[in-house]
Amino acid sequence: KFSKQSWGLENEALIVRCPRQGKPSYTVDWYYSQTNKSIPTQERNRVFASGQLLKFLPAAVADSGIYTCIVRSPTFNRTGYANVTIYKKQSDCNVPDYLMYSTVSGSEKNSKIYCPTIDLYNWTAPLEWFKNCQALQGSRYRAHKSFLVIDNVMTEDAGDYTCKFIHNENGANYSVTATRSFTVKDEQGFSLFPVIGAPAQNEIKEVEIGKNANLTCSACFGKGTQFLAAVLWQLNGTKITDFGEPRIQQEEGQNQSFSNGLACLDMVLRIADVKEEDLLLQYDCLALNLHGLRRHTVRLSRKNPIDHHS
């Protein structure tokens, strides 16, 4: 559950984030799992740890393997695993499936292609973009911050898009490339006021103290690709990241699904090792888009162990 796949190309920079997160003040130790050998923090090393980040500058095929990160606080330790694979550069233009990031869909109204993982790097604009290995040129293509915007999208715009940027570390530059597929949706989509499918308003969820619990916030927003649609969790009206309880984490990516043709988003809130004080919190599921926002609240209650005595 707390394992994450990461991949990169040899001789490029690769930065991996620990799948377990905590406050910035917590220390994070990294180990190479096979040997249990500690990853150094000194930046003079080609591979070094920097808090929640593990940096390969540059990466080598031999770096492939499983890395362990341990988030340490005064009261607990949390362990995560990063499964890193470094591939040799391809001589031909085809990008194999195992190097592809998640596919994104676009339509005439919404044609943003985000450069995957770029937020982990110290880069400066502009990004370079390629489609099927050809540099993108012309006024229809606009590199804006960390994404590419395509004007007047057509079905021919579908394909594999690669972003290329330079990561700077202490004055040294390293190249990074990332590729994802872009598909063009032809259907006439529409957008609705968010409808929260789960949880029900004022739902009570039974949990067991000491066990893990998952809460899912699920909402639908219309048909087709949705712009500015989001679902998120809050604790007592506070963002999860600001609440500062490492046991309670929001799943990083939002899962998009299509239910009865409707575009829906799910966000899972994971509560590790449920404690008594968690029962006092209000868990708010927010769904928002261009039309408006809606809120549902969940509370936790203690699940009584089944009495086996006759």
């Epitope: 006021f193 308003q201 004022n202 500015l228 809050q234 009206g237 600001d242 209000q282 708010d284 928002l288 261009l290 408006g292 926002l293 809606r294 809120r295 549902h296 609240t297």
Partner: antibody, heavy 117, light 107 residues
Framework: EVQLLQSGGGLVQPGGSLRLSCAAS????????MSWVRQAPGKGLEWVST????????YYADSVKGRFTISRDNSKNSLYLQMNSLRAEDTAVYYC??????????WGQGTLVTVSS | DIQMTQSPSSLSASVGDRVTITCRAS??????LAWYQQKPGKAPKLLIY???TLQSGVPSRFSGSGSGTDFTLTISSLQPEDFATYYC?????????FGQGTKVEIK
């Protein structure tokens, strides 16, 4: 103590424009959602508009949609309401307020907008 | 849009009285309800949020209850400074909507 200081009200002719400002202090403005609420003379409160901390999300009452624009400048800790095509029924005291999860926990002192020829 | 209906629209009471104001939503809003107090010429002041949570600094004689569609604001022992107009507001979904207000006057 959280403070919201408003400015920019006044008398304007029907069809005219006006820009209201709200200067915030003593809280992390860039993280806060903000709202505008108005109150016509002798009447109740009416929500006008809300903006998220990053300006990504903006919402409006149907009565002002297409005429009013909410915006913010986080570098100046300031919230704005640009009001165009003003009508007599827009005459009201306008309040800016911090929006904490939909509840409006701190309010500006209010500024009177009068639309009249 | 969600309609909020307050009752009564006005009431007369004496210092020390127990006062109850009700607010009804046109649909289930869970606990997403706030209560405000407004005095003439002043900005509204938040009293209660999430239907029953007392805002910091508000006297404990104010309390809120209810869930779903029916909500109540209670002032256990009315004080001279409590004579004002009270509004409920839903934040379940945009557009946020207010009740029409209840004016509490001196008997």
């Amino acid at each position: 103590e959280v403070q919201l200081l408003q400015s920019g009200g006044g008398l304007v002719q029907p069809g005219g424009s006006l820009r209201l400002s709200c200067a915030a202090s003593e809280f992390t403005f860039s993280n806060a959602w903000m709202s505008w609420v108005r109150q016509a003379p002798g009447k109740g409160l009416e929500w006008v508009s809300t903006i998220s901390g990053t300006s990504r999300y903006t919402y409006y009452a149907d009565s002002v949609k297409g005429r009013f624009t909410i915006s913010r400048d986080n570098s100046k800790n300031s919230l704005y309401l640009q009001m165009n095509s003003l009508r007599a029924e827009d005459t009201a005291v306008y309040y800016c307020a911090r929006d904490q999860d939909g509840r409006l926990d701190y309010w500006g002192q209010g500024t009177l907008v009068t639309v009249s020829s | 849009d969600i309609q909020m209906t307050q009752s009564p629209s006005s009431l007369s009471a004496s210092v020390g009285d127990r006062v109850t104001i009700t607010c009804r939503a046109s649909q289930n809003i869970g606990s997403w309800l706030a209560w405000y107090q407004q005095k003439p010429g002043k900005a509204p002041k938040l009293l209660i949020y999430r239907a029953s949570t007392l805002q910091s600094g508000v006297p404990s004689r104010f309390s809120g209850s209810g869930s779903g569609t029916d909500f109540t604001l209670t002032i256990s022992s009315l004080q001279p400074e409590d004579f004002a107009t009270y509004y409920c507001q839903q934040s379940y979904s945009t557009p946020y909507t207010f009740g029409q207000g209840t004016k509490v006057e001196i008997k």
